[in-house]
């Protein structure tokens, strides 16, 4: 007997062919001999089966000697042996309907687990193989689990169900809810405006939740909440903000924060958390602020950085168009009795300048000018 695999919710066409290429009488029945449909002349007639409103045929094919049974919106319980009676002969087709669903929402937070559950008819013994968007293969029986979802797991998962050497393919769209970057670092000169951006790695029609930015300043003994906000249908509204610093927040996505001035006392690390409605757990993004200050006090030219810098970063002081006078893997460098001219303080990583501050040193009888 012919085996046909179907997907839950899909439409399937079971074929039945007569040797005569013309419209003749046919009937489709189920294994309990209950009539599903047939014809009376050119009219389609239906029997008392549970498929009544979901069964159909195509009149245009009858003249070709084809008498299909089309079942719409397939259910697992439609799995059965269907019998086509035409020209005093019987054709049997075994239909097996499978369903594959994500047992939770298909929108999952980064780090959460995905479980795919296969619904299958009694007596079947299918195998399932799924391929993630990043090409990772997982195999299983009735359930497949993937722990610690990563951002690259967002996209279409393609799962193949194998039964009786036949296969049916499912596509499940998974959205991993996360920020585009786990961590970011902003380098600023003292006094400059600071922009923090927290772009999301996903798009959904309606996004509702609440968030908070906690800040651990390098100079402070404990962290403090800088801002709390609500998100309703992608609209941002500030709930509470500290007086120092007085952050400003954009009203639209992506989440955007502005610090009016970069000051040494603000240098440090922040953690923005976003709790989404109807989701357990939170999204996190770390943000770091490094602040640079170049000063001249009497005969001492000093350059300092505050904030989370890597030990491999180089801090240098150099007179414009000259070799660096001082260059160290430290957070402060200085030059005694600096020559007059435009001095540059540079924070660099393997030769790439991350931050630069210029200070003009005047001849000794003058006071320094900061551009």
């Amino acid at each position: 007997k012919k085996v046909v695999l179907g997907k839950k919710g899909d439409t399937v066409e079971l074929t039945c062919t007569a040797s005569q290429k013309k419209s003749i009488q046919f009937h489709w029945k189920n294994s309990n001999q209950i009539k599903i449909l047939g014809n009376q002349g050119s009219f389609l007639t239906k029997g008392p089966s549970k498929l009544n409103d979901r069964a159909d045929s195509r009149r245009s094919l009858w003249d070709q000697g084809n008498f299909p049974l089309i079942i719409k919106n397939l259910k697992i319980e439609d799995s059965d042996t269907y019998i086509c009676e035409v020209e005093d002969q019987k054709e049997e087709v075994q239909l097996l309907v499978f369903g594959l669903t994500a047992n939770s929402d298909t929108h999952l937070l980064q780090g959460q687990s995905l479980t795919l559950t296969l619904e299958s008819p009694p007596g079947s013994s299918p195998s399932v193989q799924c391929r993630s968007p990043r090409g990772k293969n997982i195999q299983g029986g009735k359930t497949l689990s993937v722990s610690q979802l990563e951002l690259q797991d967002s996209g279409t998962w393609t799962c193949t169900v194998l039964q009786n050497q036949k296969k049916v393919e499912f596509k499940i769209d998974i959205v991993v809810l996360a920020f585009q970057k786990a961590s970011s670092i902003v380098y600023k000169k003292e006094g400059e405006q600071v922009e923090f951006s927290f772009p999301l790695a996903f798009t959904v029609e309606k996004l509702t939740g609440s968030g908070e930015l906690w800040w651990q300043a390098e100079r402070a003994s404990s962290s403090k909440s800088w801002i709390t906000f609500d998100l309703k249908n992608k609209e941002v509204s500030v709930k509470r903000v500290t007086q120092d610093p007085k952050l400003q927040m954009g009203k639209k996505l992506p989440l955007h924060l502005t610090l009016p001035q970069a000051l040494p006392q603000y240098a440090g690390s922040g953690n923005l958390t976003l709790a989404l409605e109807a989701k357990t757990g939170k999204l996190h993004q770390e943000v770091n602020l490094v602040v640079m200050r170049a000063t001249q006090l009497q005969k001492n030219l000093t350059c300092e950085v505050w904030g989370p810098t890597s030990p491999k970063l180089m801090l240098s002081l150099k007179l414009e168009n000259k070799e660096a006078k001082v260059s160290k893997r430290e957070k402060a460098v200085w030059v005694l009795n600096p020559e007059a001219g435009m001095w540059q303080c540079l924070l660099s990583d393997s030769g790439q300048v991350l931050l630069e501050s210029n200070i003009k040193v005047l001849p000794t009888w003058s006071t320094p000018v900061q551009p």
Partner: antibody
């Protein structure tokens, strides 16, 4: 809900080949026939032909020698090629899903054949 | 090929009127007939299938009847959005064919 979105070249010269593709979003790709219908400006509807997910085709005898309908189930899309076009092939071309009746329809693509 | 002939080819009516459009097949097509509505610049939309079954979401003022070779589409009380062109289509045999259309215009 099933949605059909079609695309392809809108301006052709006589003797060229018309090529249109229809993307199917949502719903079942199997079990239905995927159809092309055209409508010359200010005129009625003409059935061109159809294909199912396994590649079985039926087409209008009046166009059969020039029509090729193909399907790519992995992309949930089907395509129409009409060779040796003339000005008489100028029409809005629609893709649609069929199970005896046509529903839903693509947005339509105006194809103009002009030298 | 089965020829489908619609009449009238155009009809003028007012909001609230009852309108009937007929469709005749050149041979018996049982009840393998559908009705579509098309507005300018848009794709046709299925209204009625199997001669008399109303598609879900279509207002109940639309109804279809007939069997064999003669069919009718009735709009019981015209609404402003009903002014459009209507087509019948047979699904009895290949090639599928349509009527030439009936344009329903505001009087």
């Amino acid at each position: 809900q099933v949605q059909l979105q079609q695309w392809g070249a809108g301006l052709l010269k006589p003797s060229e080949t018309l090529s249109l593709t229809c993307d199917v979003y949502g719903g079942s790709f199997s079990g239905y026939y995927w159809t092309w219908i055209r409508q010359p400006p200010g005129k009625g509807l003409e059935w061109i032909g159809e294909i199912n997910h396994s590649g079985t085709t039926n087409s209008n005898p009046s166009l059969k020698s020039r029509v090729t309908i193909s399907v790519d189930t992995s992309k949930s899309q089907f395509s129409l090629r009409l060779s040796s076009v003339t000005a008489a092939d100028t029409a809005v071309y629609f893709c649609t899903r069929e199970l005896n009746w046509f529903d839903p329809w693509g947005q339509g693509t105006l194809v103009t054949v002009s030298s | 090929d089965i020829q489908m002939t619609q009449s009238p080819s155009s009809v003028s009516a007012s909001v609230g009127d009852r309108v009937t459009i007929t469709c005749r097949a050149s041979q018996d097509i049982a009840n393998w007939l559908a009705w579509y509505q098309q507005k300018p610049g848009k794709a046709p939309q299925l209204l009625i299938y199997a001669a008399s079954s109303l598609l879900g979401g279509v207002p109940s003022r639309f109804s279809g009847s007939g069997s064999g070779a003669d069919f009718t589409l009735t709009i019981s009380s015209l609404h402003p959005e009903d002014f459009a062109t209507y087509y019948c289509q047979q699904a009895n045999s290949f090639p599928y064919t349509f009527g030439q259309g009936t344009k329903l215009e505001i009087k």
